[in-house]
């Protein structure tokens, strides 16, 4: 029971985590304009992995995609790659873990196979979570570096005559979503790995013993119980629960607060 709970919880936590990683990757608020030194700006800038947006004084928000690949910073490309790898691994992990769930019966799948699939999905979730955390952390580091660089030369202009306040960027909501989501996926993966240990059938090394009765030759082969599966060869009168696996496609891509027009 504890194994089933651990596996189920691991799956749910990972599912939430991966949904969060997808949401974070799609969000536009990876970096937002720092308003600390300029709280009265009527134009608010924020940027994502795929496009940059400007909210204007009338409330209109204009977003423009990065229509170049080669012109983008290598770090941004690396973050994109890490997040996509995280999503792909997580999605595969989810697919594998659905079939590995103890509460779902698929044919005559052995517990050892379920254990292996649970471990595989767990490792995938761990790597997926690490990819997301790494991606978000690389981006955050990039922001911190750029923030202090732009602070060093806060005002640029022609011989100090024209004051042009350089736009500084700070952490956006997507970073926090990404960190939390990555952490959840990681925790979910660890839980799956723990559940795998409880799922693995204990090997019993009894030899098959033949008892010769007069006139009859009956062989008894004691062969260890399946580890608390409830699914032996005799499934008569046993309810098989098909968990009705649903795909969680409806991850809400964060609507930019002002994208309405």
């Amino acid at each position: 029971m504890a194994v089933t709970a651990c596996q189920g919880l691991g799956f749910v936590v990972s599912l939430i985590g991966i949904a969060g990683i997808i949401a974070a990757t799609c969000m536009d608020q990876w970096s937002t304009q720092d308003l600390y030194n300029n709280p009265v700006t009527a134009v608010f800038n924020y940027q994502g992995l795929w496009r940059s947006c400007v909210r204007e004084s009338s409330g209109f928000t204009e977003c423009r995609g990065y229509f170049t690949l080669l012109g983008l910073p290598a770090m941004l490309q690396a973050v994109r790659a890490l997040m996509i790898v995280g999503i792909v691994l997580g999605a595969i992990g989810l697919l594998v873990s659905i079939f590995a769930l103890k509460c779902i019966r698929i044919g005559s799948m052995e517990d050892s196979a379920k254990a292996n699939m649970t471990l595989t999905s767990g490792i995938m979730f761990i790597v997926s979570g690490l990819c997301a955390i790494a991606g978000v952390s690389v981006f955050a580091n990039m922001l911190v570096t750029n923030f202090w660089m732009s602070t060093a030369n806060m005002y640029t202009g022609m011989g100090g005559m024209v004051q042009t306040v350089q736009t500084r960027y700070t952490f956006g909501a997507a970073l926090f979503v990404g960190w939390v989501a990555g952490g959840l996926t990681l925790i979910g993966g660890v839980m799956m790995c723990i559940a795998c240990r409880g799922l693995a059938p204990e090997e019993t090394n009894y030899k098959a013993v033949s008892y010769h009765a007069s006139g009859h030759s009956v062989a008894y082969k004691p062969g260890g119980f399946k580890a608390s599966t409830g699914f032996g060869s005799n499934t008569k009168n046993k309810k098989i629960y098909d968990g009705g696996a649903r795909t969680e496609d409806e991850v809400q891509s964060y609507p930019s607060k002002h994208d309405y027009v």
Partner: antibody, heavy 115, light 113 residues
Framework: DVQLQESGPGLVKPSQSLSLSCSVT?????????WTWFRQFPGNKLEWMGY???????NYNPSLKNRISITRDTSKNQFFLKLNSVTTEDTATYYC????????WGQGTLVTVSA | DIVMTQSPSSLTVTTGEKVTMSCKSS????????????LTWYQQKPGQPPKLLVY???TRESGVPARFTGSGSGTVFTLTISSVQAEDLAVYYC?????????FGAGTRLELK
């Protein structure tokens, strides 16, 4: 087509409150944009007063901050301006406006503050 | 607050003439996020509300005749009317659209000789 129309009393006594409404047709005030009030003084000087956002948040001109309030009635698709403790200095034509770069303005309503 | 200074305060012109009016802001209205200058020009005729002419310092609003041209960057901007028509006689305002509170210039009045 989007249209804005201001309405309210044309004469207000000093120290009283000035209340104006702006009716919007052709667009829902909850769908987007900041719904803004401007005023133009007799000498033609234009002043931005403040706005109510499509999500209900406000931003006001600091020079009016403790006197101004902009609210809305989403069911009637209207937004309102309330200016407290008016003086003769508040005599102006009041405009409501919205959309990108304030492309749409109401026709304006002249409010005279006089005893 | 950002101070917008317009010059001249009035211009007396004849139809067909080229007209240039200036607007200076006390701080740069350039936004590095999208590389745009948040300076807007409005035209106001007597008894009418202001009408949007040019935004982002140089982008004409749809329906505005091509004779109206905005230019400039940072803190210095100009509005040029290549060939003034009788219907262009109005007051022209520049507006800081980058900082709250949004502020307007005092206006340039275009009058017929």
């Amino acid at each position: 087509d989007v249209q804005l129309q201001e309405s309210g009393p044309g004469l207000v006594k000093p120290s009283q409150s000035l209340s104006l409404s702006c009716s919007v047709t052709g667009y829902s005030i909850t769908s987007g944009y900041f719904w803004t009030w401007f005023r133009q003084f007799p000498g033609n000087k234009l002043e931005w007063m403040g706005y109510i956002s499509y999500d209900g948040s406000n931003n006001y001109n600091p020079s009016l901050k403790n006197r101004i309030s902009i609210t809305r009635d989403t069911s009637k698709n209207q937004f309102f301006l309330k200016l407290n403790s008016v003086t003769t200095e508040d005599t102006a034509t009041y405009y409501c406006a919205s959309f990108r770069f304030f492309a749409y303005w109401g026709q304006g309503t002249l409010v005279t503050v006089s005893a | 607050d950002i101070v917008m200074t317009q010059s001249p305060s009035s211009l007396t012109v004849t139809t067909g003439e080229k007209v240039t009016m200036s607007c200076k802001s006390s701080q740069s209205v350039f936004n590095s996020g999208n590389q745009k200058n948040y300076l807007t020009w409005y035209q106001q005729k007597p008894g009418q509300p202001p009408k949007l002419l040019v935004y982002w310092a140089s982008t004409r609003e749809s329906g505005v005749p091509a004779r109206f041209t905005g230019s400039g960057s940072g803190t210095v901007f100009t509005l040029t009317i290549s060939s003034v028509q009788a219907e262009d006689l109005a007051v022209y305002y520049c507006q800081n659209d980058y900082y709250f509170p949004l502020t307007f210039g005092a206006g340039t009045r275009l009058e017929l000789k």
